[in-house]
Amino acid sequence: GSVKVLHEPSCFSDYISTSVCQWKMDHPTNCSAELRLSYQLDFMGSENHTCVPENREDSVCVCSMPIDDAVEADVYQLDLWAGQQLLWSGSFQPSKHVKPRTPGNLTVHPNISHTWLLMWTNPYPTENHLHSELTYMVNVSNDNDPEDFKVYNVTYMGPTLRLAASTLKSGASYSARVRAWAQTYNSTWSDWSPSTTWLNYYEPWEQHL
């Protein structure tokens, strides 16, 4: 039967080592057996490379392509093949389609003056362009009360957030997660980090009276 692409490839780059493309076929497809995504940097002498896609869902394919440390001028030619049949052809500029890596190692520590110190790691090495470009969103939610959640935008450089324990319900269990974006690259948000959970044992001042 004829092989057709329902939703053409959408690609994002972490701007350091990997670009990921995802697309949807018009019927359930064994992506790795039936399809190949070829990619070639538009640069004199560059070679053609092949990515073997994997299934994300029945008819959704995803391809992770190792790329060199991206620079703004890089443009890739992409061709999606089903055997000898060219299904789709397009170009992709990593610097224009950035999805930052997920922040890592989110931890919560008790700090002075009844505050919690949330810390995480910047997912980029200092020499990478994105290291100094990231801002973060921290989501803090009550594990037992879906209505009790707060969102904090961290627009300063350090990957930390100080949280007054008094802003959270005493005795409740809270979870936090963090994601990143790069404003100057007009990026999308990264995936959320894994959640970390802690018990807010702060006693309201009234209980001391």
């Epitope: 940097l41 640069f43 004199m44 002498g45 560059s46 070679e47 053609n48 490379h49 190792p66 790329i67 060199d68 620079v71 703004e72 001028a73 890089d74």
Partner: antibody, heavy 125, light 112 residues
Framework: EVQLVESGGDLVKPGGSLRLSCVAS????????MTWVRQAPGKGLQWVSL????????YYADAVKGRFTISRDNAKNTLYLQMNSLRAEDTAVYYC??????????????????WGQGTLVTVSS | DIVMTQTPLSLSVSPGETASISCRSS???????????LDWYLQKPGQSPQGLIY???KRASGVPDRFSGSGSGTDFTLRISRVEANDTGVYYC?????????FGQGTKLEIK
């Protein structure tokens, strides 16, 4: 030690054909793009053609496009230049040179970092 | 095509002095920060060309540090300090960024 040895240069009549060869040693031939550069008597250097490491992509100067074909045999560590429809203005010493490393996603550039001794092509009636 | 223009076309320098050769390109050779695709080559009399400088300022293997390259974008300079008799020959700049690769006209260096 890197060595490039060209051969195949000769005296040929206008409209004739010639095939130049360049045998490489001392480096991993298949990993590098290769280039032909020529030099007409008493003139400067002129780039002719480039082929990437696998041979999948080729580039030509406008002056030779459609007449010259660059190719390579990685099993034999040999670069070729097939020259057809030769003209008097193709008279030159032809050099092969090692160009960029192409096994990486973005080719790594070191300039034309090794050159052969050259082979003379004379096109005259 | 990118046009490469060298100045001067000939140069006469006394031993021990510094020689400077300029090369200008009709388009920027800067692909990304620190990556100017501009090379310098020397062709000594009766010999094949040899690489001196690549990516604007990086010395090729075995090239003495008397040779230095500088510049970015469209303007580049080759400097040869403490010139020696052995430096005689024709110096060429070349852009390696895009096809067709193009050379400058060459600068003939003569040692007085």
């Amino acid at each position: 030690e890197v060595q490039l040895v060209e051969s195949g240069g000769d005296l040929v009549k206008p409209g004739g054909s010639l095939r130049l060869s360049c045998v490489a040693s001392g480096f991993t031939f298949r990993d590098y793009a290769m280039t032909w550069v020529r030099q007409a008597p008493g003139k400067g250097l002129q780039w002719v053609s480039l082929i990437n490491g696998t041979g999948g992509k080729t580039y030509y100067a406008d002056a030779v496009k459609g007449r010259f074909t660059i190719s390579r045999d990685n099993a034999k560590n040999t670069l070729y230049l097939q020259m057809n429809s030769l003209r008097a203005e193709d008279t030159a010493v032809y050099y092969c040179a090692v160009d960029r490393l192409t096994k990486t996603i973005r080719p790594q550039y070191y300039g034309l970092w090794a050159w052969g001794q050259g082979t003379l092509v004379t096109v005259s009636s | 095509d990118i046009v490469m223009t060298q100045t001067p076309l000939s140069l006469s320098v006394s031993p021990g002095e510094t020689a400077s050769i300029s090369c200008r390109s009709s388009q920027s050779l800067l692909y990304s920060i620190g990556y100017n695709y501009l090379d310098w080559y020397l062709q000594k009399p009766g010999q094949s060309p040899q690489g001196l400088i690549y990516l604007g300022s990086k010395r090729a293997s075995g090239v003495p540090d008397r040779f230095s390259g500088s510049g970015s974008g469209t303007d580049f300079t080759l400097r040869i300090s403490r010139v020696e008799a052995n430096d005689t020959g024709v110096y060429y700049c070349m852009q390696g960024l895009q096809s067709p690769l193009t050379f400058g006209q060459g600068t003939k260096l003569e040692i007085k």
